[in-house]
Amino acid sequence: EKLPKAPVITTPLETVDALVEEVATFMCAVESYPQPEISWTRNKILIKLFDTRYSIRENGQLLTILSVEDSDDGIYCCIANNGVGGAVESCGALQVKMKPKITRPPINVKIIEGLKAVLPCTTMGNPKPSVSWIKGDNALRENSRIAVLESGSLRIHNVQKEDAGQYRCVAKNSLGTAYSKLVKLEVEVFARILRAPESHNVTFGSFVTLRCTAIGIPVPTISWIENGNAVSSGSIQESVKDRVIDSRLQLFITKPGLYTCIATNKHGEKFSTAKAAATVSIAEWSKSQKDSQGYCAQYRGEVCDAVLAKDALVFFNTSYRDPEDAQELLIHTAWNELKAVSPLCRPAAEALLCNHLFQECSPGVVPTPMPICREYCLAVKELFCAKEWQAMEGKAHRGLYRSGMHLLPVPECSKLPSMHRDPTACTRLPYLDYKKENITTFPSITSSRPSADIPNLPASTSSFAVSPAYSMT
């Protein structure tokens, strides 16, 4: 009769590599007498004999996983016990190997230029797949803007037009490669004006063409506004080339106006717009005051409220469809331009512009606007804003578009009446008188004769030494 013998595992369990849906077998050969009872555990949890996912044969020495799932990963142990001595155990790992699989593929994306785009690409696989991206037919290179994240997603910071195109992600491990479908990244660009319409000073009855060029994706549409309303006359010609729209508005000029070009394009439910304005003025318009049609009334706007004299009547030009609104829009546009000028120039220019656009008015039978006195205009031009004026004229000559004051509706000083000829025929700017006395950076002041009735002037006369042309007394 055989002697009892404690169990000995003669073939210890080894690590088993298995592909998903394939068969995996662990062998646990045991020598013992009497025959042992063999049980199996996965991650220390007993595998039940009646679990149909497993097959246990050869008196329990063979464990077969019939169709491996990725959740079967873990440590498998066989435990042999026959009552003689202690139970013995051997363990081995099951590593579930898996070809790459893309679980969350990228989708088509529309993104606005400058924003961040993320194209997802979540993968599964063992070994863990490496993820790369292809744009068009070429492998995509990472840089400071473009990165493949740990998750496999592609992140593009500050999206540029050139990022548009077809993308696919590639997941690769030692067992194979998976490709996503091609997806499209479309980059949309806010409407932007490339070429703003230019302001014109023309004679009554001339033809003027205002040109406005805009770019954007999708291609913008351009509309024109005249003094705040849709353009009522004139013809518009448009052409589109390489996502650039060129619009030309031809006008027959019978009145001055503020013309605004508005470029608009749509991004989903939202619109982006860009605006640029130009003034069309009629040469000698302000000179022929007798022909001016308009009315005198109190100023109700916001922009010039602090500049114009309280309760003063100002002139509203009825050549505009809505004079109050048109003149307010002109001054508002001008005001924004003034943000660029120096602190010395700005208040003086504001005083000049407000009093030029909203001229003091004598009601009478024919409402008559009173232009600014030439001397005050020249003081702004040659003293307070000399630097800005020179820059503006220089840029205008070189054909450049905008410089602080370029688009401002500034008067032509030489055409304004002199306060020496008729002090009642023109408007003074008290601000300048006050500043003249209070700013120490002025040129030296000479005295020669008694002062006229200008607010805040001392009894002695003062003339700016810069030029006798604008002596303010």
Epitope: Q298, R300, D311, D325
Partner: antibody
Framework: ELQLVESGGGLVQPGGSLRLSCAAS????????MSWVRQAPGKGLEWVSA????????YYKESVKGRFTISRDNAKKTLYLQMNSLKSEDTAVYYC??????????????WGQGTLVTVSS | QAVVTQEPSLSVSPGGTVTLTCGLS?????????PDWYQQTPGQAPRALIY???SRLSGVPSRFSGSFSGNKAALTITGAQPEDEADYYC????????????FGGGTKLTVL
């Protein structure tokens, strides 16, 4: 079609607060001044507050100054009236109205249907 | 603060002409007050008729006209229609002290 739709009215106790909103559609909201006008039951119209197209200034009837605040969100095409320290004399239908131009003052060429504010204990 | 005055009530026969006025308790109404006129029928929101003294809003019948009459602003209805029976309000811009827009007390117009 141009529309102004007021909301936010209701019953509030004296000293309480309400915020009225006016949702605008059918026109370029940021090109126009806006106003609030109220009408007490059986009484006439009373201008309350105004704001220009860009929200750069605000104007109020003397009796509501310091208690009411008008504001606008041009992106949301919405006009607001925040009413604090409400009094029984503020009870009225509050109309939101559109100006015919950019500046705050002038003819009100489009009106909402109004929202009733009742201040009572 | 100045009060804007209007006739409390007026009546007119269909086809007749009626003039509503708008004054100031102190002083005259001028173009600087930019007189505006509104019509309100029961249960409805107001509707603007005339702005800045004499400009008619689009869609407003030509029988409505605005003007000055002495030191007041005036709204004239020439050839009154039954549907013109309503409350009429004038509103004035007051810019002198603090800026304000002031409505008159309204005129109840009856078309008999």
């Amino acid at each position: 079609e141009l529309q102004l739709v007021e909301s936010g009215g209701g019953l509030v106790q004296p000293g309480g607060s309400l915020r009225l909103s006016c949702a605008a559609s059918g026109f370029t909201f940021d090109d126009y001044g806006m106003s609030w006008v109220r009408q007490a039951p059986g009484k006439g119209l009373e201008w309350v507050s105004a704001i220009p197209w860009n929200g750069g200034s605000t104007y109020y009837k003397e009796s509501v100054k310091g208690r009411f605040t008008i504001s606008r969100d041009n992106a949301k095409k919405t006009l607001y009236l925040q009413m604090n320290s409400l009094k029984s004399e503020d009870t009225a239908v509050y109309y939101c109205a559109k100006r015919s131009g950019r500046i705050a003052f002038g003819a009100l060429d489009a009106w909402g249907q109004g929202t009733l504010v009742t201040v009572s204990s | 603060q100045a009060v804007v005055t209007q006739e409390p009530s007026l009546s007119v026969s269909p086809g007749g002409t009626v003039t509503l006025t708008c004054g100031l308790s102190s002083g005259s109404v001028t173009s600087s007050n930019y007189p505006d006129w509104y019509q309100q029928t029961p249960g409805q929101a107001p509707r603007a008729l005339i702005y800045s003294t004499n400009s008619r809003l689009s869609g407003v019948p030509s029988r409505f006209s605005g003007s000055f009459s002495g030191n007041k602003a005036a709204l004239t209805i020439t050839g009154a229609q039954p549907e013109d029976e309503a409350d009429y309000y004038c509103a004035l811009y007051m810019g002198s002290e603090s800026r304000n827009y002031v409505f008159g007390g309204g005129t109840k117009l009856t078309v008999l």
